[in-house]
């Protein structure tokens, strides 16, 4: 139903969901930090742009005694419950940011008629995919989906010269929040990146991904998982591996790779690894301070979500345009904004774009070494290292399929 | 905290080359623009070029095209300038300098502000 | 190219006075506009980015407004070590081609 917004004559409020459930485990008090922070910025953005207005938020907690897994998995009527609260006290800000579960906000986005624009940190699954008023500031299944689909029919490049149709996806349903989303597109058979491969299988036990390795009536070279390193040694291990087999493995939200002292280990050799271009450090936030590089994406994503809102204000008002019109709610995409380390570009459907990276482990070096570039928002590789010291024979990723010859 | 190292004063003869190098300290380089930019003796700010490192490619201003080269070297995290049939008008101050940071946009076309500069390497074109 | 013309070129105020640059772009740059602060032998120094953010340690009383093709950076109450050269950059079609207007330099009265 309608609620009435506390968003005119010069105050601007926004509605900040602290949910039990969430993306990821981060105490609230550091996304109330980051929020803080985010709100000293946009007020003085908007001083400085000769803008004379008061913008606050307001955190609306849910009833931890019904909502206290910390699951997602267990999140769909959570927003729903803290929708009717924000309805019952009339207290609607100009904007919703939160929730970040994919179920929470497919809920809340089915169940109300949403005439305000809803920010959120996660919300990472297809069936968040194209919604009018819903902007997504952490990379969204569909930005990974396309990025593999592309990748799979590069078969132009110097050490790729062979198009792939065929992938293994290691999933069983232990993944975090983020990785849950990524590989549950790349499972759906109604998905993109279905549509376009020819054969796919999901491994869902250690034991199925560990005989995958060594088998040799495999039906593909090629298996994709999620998480970071140690994920990948506590199922692979010492194991022996075929020469010609790749994993992908998906970690976007980490930096670690890039950092100067860091060797890639061993068991890394046979492995690429597709994480985001790195950010700032950060170091010098108090909302980021002991944060792990996931975690701090998360709160940053807070942080960001009220940077946006501020530049929105700051062009409705200087316009003179009303902010409670459906024309604000539909405004937050197709565009870029002054982030909090960098600019930050949002596509048609209000969802990030960012700079993806795919690493591979030189043989020479036992460094993370730069391959490709990909950038989300042109659906467009680059590739950098034209000669990579691969463990692959003749420096070139293998065919998909073994025993296939050229195509 | 994340600073610019830069090569020292140059004096080079007309129709000579430079090569000038900035290096990184204290944080990623990867993922950032390194622009160069030069200002004559009582002069202002003149852009050059620039390079993002995981791009590997390099954008000049038309001035320079053809006889500027900005590389990278990410083992090193160091950026080098290379201009080429020097002239007295080149006589500047070349100044290295990062930008913000592109994580979540659009690859090379991310528009972007200097945080970060070198402390300038003076070449002198004299014969 | 975009050409960015700043004025005054030169700007007599005296300590505690205010101080008001102008930066005019000659086609539109939206916000993506920076002002730097040079001291004789320095580098330059980020000022404010996105035509009106103060970059990270900047004091309050430096200030950056519109957006487009007309900016303004002001300095509220000039003190001693504000006297300087001021730029404005667009960065606003990286690439080809960032352009610096010609500077405004700030001298005590």
């Known amino acids: 139903s309608q609620v009435s917004q506390n968003c005119h004559n010069g105050s601007y409020e926004i509605s900040v969901l602290m949910m039990g459930n969430s993306a990821f485990a981060e105490p609230l008090k550091n996304l109330e930090d980051a929020v803080n922070e985010g709100l000293e910025i946009v007020r003085g953005r908007l001083q400085n742009a000769g803008l004379n207005v008061t913008v606050n938020a307001t955190f609306m907690y849910s009833d931890g005694l019904i909502h206290n897994s910390g699951d997602c998995r267990s999140s769909t009527c959570e927003g729903l419950d803290l929708l009717r609260k924000i309805s019952n006290a009339q207290r609607m800000g100009c904007v919703l940011i939160g929730p970040s579960c994919t179920y929470s906000t497919f809920q809340m986005y089915l169940d109300t008629e949403l005439s305000y624009p809803m920010i959120s940190a996660g919300s990472f699954g297809l069936s968040c995919d194209y919604k009018e008023t819903l902007t997504r500031l952490m990379s969204p299944a569909r930005k990974l989906m396309y990025f593999l689909v592309n990748f799979w029919k590069t078969n132009d490049l110097p050490f790729k010269t062979y198009s792939w149709s065929t992938s293994y996806v290691y999933k069983n349903g232990t993944e975090t929040e983020d990785c849950f989303w990524y590989l549950n597109a790349l499972e759906a058979s109604v998905s993109y990146f279905s549509h376009e491969l020819g054969f796919k299988v999901v491994l869902r036990q250690d034991k199925e991904f560990q005989d995958i390795l060594m088998d040799h009536n495999r039906k593909s070279n090629v298996i994709i998982m999620c998480g970071g390193p140690e994920f990948l040694y506590k199922l692979k291990g010492d194991r022996a591996v075929a020469e010609d087999i790749v994993i992908i493995l998906v970690d976007l939200f980490n930096d670690q790779y890039f950092e100067d002292n860091v060797t890639a280990p061993d068991y890394m050799k046979n492995v690429l690894v597709l994480t985001l271009s790195p950010g700032n450090s950060l170091l010098n936030s108090s909302f980021s301070r002991n944060l792990s590089p996931t975690k701090r994406d998360f709160a940053l994503a807070y942080l960001n979500g009220i940077l946006l809102f501020g530049h929105m204000l700051k062009i409705f008002l200087e316009n003179g345009e009303n902010i409670t019109t459906p024309k604000f709610a539909h405004a937050f995409r197709n565009l870029t904004f002054e982030g909090y380390d960098g600019p930050v570009t949002l596509d048609d459907w209000g969802d990030v774009d960012s700079t993806m990276v795919l690493l591979y482990t030189s043989v020479d070096t036992k460094k993370y070494k730069v391959l490709l570039t990909y950038d989300t928002h042109v659906n467009k590789t680059y590739p950098v290292d034209m000669s990579p010291t691969f463990t692959w024979k003749n420096s070139k990723l293998p065919n998909d399929i073994t025993g296939r010859g050229p195509q | 905290e994340v600073q610019l190292v830069q090569s020292g004063a140059e004096v080079k003869k007309p129709g000579s080359s430079v090569k000038v190098s900035c290096k990184a300290s204290?944080?990623?380089?990867?993922?950032?623009?390194i622009s160069w930019v030069r200002q004559a003796p009582g002069q202002g700010l003149e852009w050059m070029g620039g390079?993002?490192?995981?791009?590997?490619?390099?954008n000049y201003a038309q001035k320079f095209q053809g006889r500027v080269t900005i590389t990278a070297d990410e083992s090193t995290s160091t950026a080098y300038m290379e201009l080429s049939s020097l002239r007295s008008e080149d006589t500047a101050v070349y100044y290295c300098?990062?930008?913000?940071?592109?994580?979540?946009?659009?690859?090379?076309?991310?528009?972007?502000?200097?945080?970060?500069w070198g402390q300038g390497t003076m070449v002198t074109v004299s014969s | 190219e975009i050409v960015l013309t700043q004025s005054p070129a030169t700007l007599s105020v005296s300590p505690g006075e205010r101080a008001t640059l102008s930066c005019r772009a000659s086609?539109?740059?939206?916000?993506?506009l920076a002002w730097y602060q040079q001291k004789p032998g320095q580098a330059p120094r980020l000022l404010i980015y996105?035509?009106?953010t103060r970059a990270t340690g900047i004091p309050a009383r430096f200030s950056g407004s519109g957006s487009g093709t007309e900016f303004t950076l002001t300095i509220s109450s000039l003190q001693s070590e504000d006297f300087a050269v001021y730029y404005c950059q667009q960065y606003n079609n990286w690439p080809p081609a960032l352009t610096f207007g010609g500077g405004t330099k700030v001298e005590i009265k």
């Open positions: 086609q539109s740059v939206s916000s993506n």
């Open positions: 300098a990062r930008d913000r940071g592109r994580r979540y946009c659009s690859g090379g076309s991310c528009p972007n502000a200097f945080d970060i």
């Open positions: 390079i993002i490192p995981i791009f590997g490619t390099a």
């Open positions: 204290g944080g990623t380089f990867s993922s950032y623009a």
């Open positions: 996105g035509a009106s």
